[in-house]
């Protein structure tokens, strides 16, 4: 777990001061009104791999 102000969270996650950890923004799609997810509103979506070419 990182401290705020150091290297950014990995792509698809955002730092939560309420949890003192990086928040997986995928888990915020079902819970956008949580304060834990405030940073995810501006975070880019997590990368995904196409299941077909």
């Amino acid at each position: 777990e990182q401290a705020p102000g150091t290297a950014p969270c990995s792509r698809g996650s955002s730092w939560s001061a309420d949890l003192d950890k990086c928040m997986d923004c995928a888990s915020c799609r079902a819970r956008p009104k949580s304060d834990f997810c405030l940073g995810c509103a501006a975070a880019p979506p997590a990368p995904f791999r196409l299941l077909w070419p």
Partner: antibody, heavy 120, light 108 residues
Framework: EVQLLESGGGLVQPGGSLRLSCAAS????????MIWVRQAPGKGLEWVSY????????HYADSVKGRFTISRDNSKNTLYLQMNSLRAEDTAVYYC?????????????WGQGTLVTVSS | DIQMTQSPSSLSASVGDRVTITCRAS??????LNWYQQKPGKAPKLLIY???SLQSGVPSRFSGSGSGTDFTLTISSLQPEDFATYYC??????????FGQGTKVEIK
């Protein structure tokens, strides 16, 4: 065994102050968000306050905002609730509870509670 | 704020009965709903988290279901130790959480 033990409750006059403590044992305290919840006599549960694992982020119910202060000392495995400007409607059993799961989705361990009575 | 409304407020049942308690949220909370049991003079105890997951050590006669705004707690066969008050709680707006008003399960 995980244990949370509240103390500091008692009888206080309106306008007075109290500091509640919640001593944690049986687990590593510092990674867990913590909350205070209260229950007025014969009533339901009411969330009071939240504190992040480091103590750097806090939140309060509107009913106590500006009067109560939550804090923690991770070196002492202890959670606190400083209660100022107490009112009759603050009379309740106060519980501390541990936030469970990665994203604080529920409360898996609770203390036994400490009774705060505000009366003249 | 999201309001949580439980029904009924109280019920009388016999040992062996199947008991269902309902919790309704004032707006969709997805599956962020937990259930607690509280006995007189005791702290609440977590039974079900995230609508349907059984907390470790809780008997399998307890189950939860629902999503969105409507949720249920079911006790498949009521036991003497199950007479208590049950609360739902939403964590959709964490860390600002709210509880239902409680449902008291009494002996018929």
């Amino acid at each position: 065994e995980v244990q949370l033990l509240e103390s500091g409750g008692g009888l206080v006059q309106p306008g007075g102050s109290l500091r509640l403590s919640c001593a944690a044992s049986g687990f590593t305290f510092s990674p867990y968000p913590m909350i205070w919840v209260r229950q007025a006599p014969g009533k339901g549960l009411e969330w009071v306050s939240y504190i992040s694992p480091s103590g750097g982020s806090t939140h309060y119910a509107d009913s106590v905002k500006g009067r109560f202060t939550i804090s923690r000392d991770n070196s002492k495995n202890t959670l606190y609730l400083q209660m100022n400007s107490l009112r009759a409607e603050d009379t309740a059993v106060y519980y501390c509870a541990r936030g469970g799961d990665t994203y604080f989705d529920y409360f898996d361990y609770w203390g036994q509670g400490t009774l705060v009575t505000v009366s003249s | 704020d999201i309001q949580m409304t439980q029904s009924p407020s109280s019920l009388s049942a016999s040992v062996g009965d199947r008991v269902t308690i309902t919790c309704r949220a004032s707006q969709s909370i997805s599956g962020y709903l937990n259930w607690y049991q509280q006995k007189p003079g005791k702290a609440p105890k977590l039974l079900i988290y995230q609508a349907s997951s059984l907390q470790s050590g809780v008997p399998s006669r307890f189950s939860g279901s629902g999503s969105g705004t409507d949720f249920t707690l079911t006790i498949s066969s009521l036991q003497p130790e199950d007479f208590a008050t049950y609360y739902c709680q939403q964590s959709y707006t964490s860390p600002f959480i709210t509880f239902g008003q409680g449902t008291k399960v009494e002996i018929k």
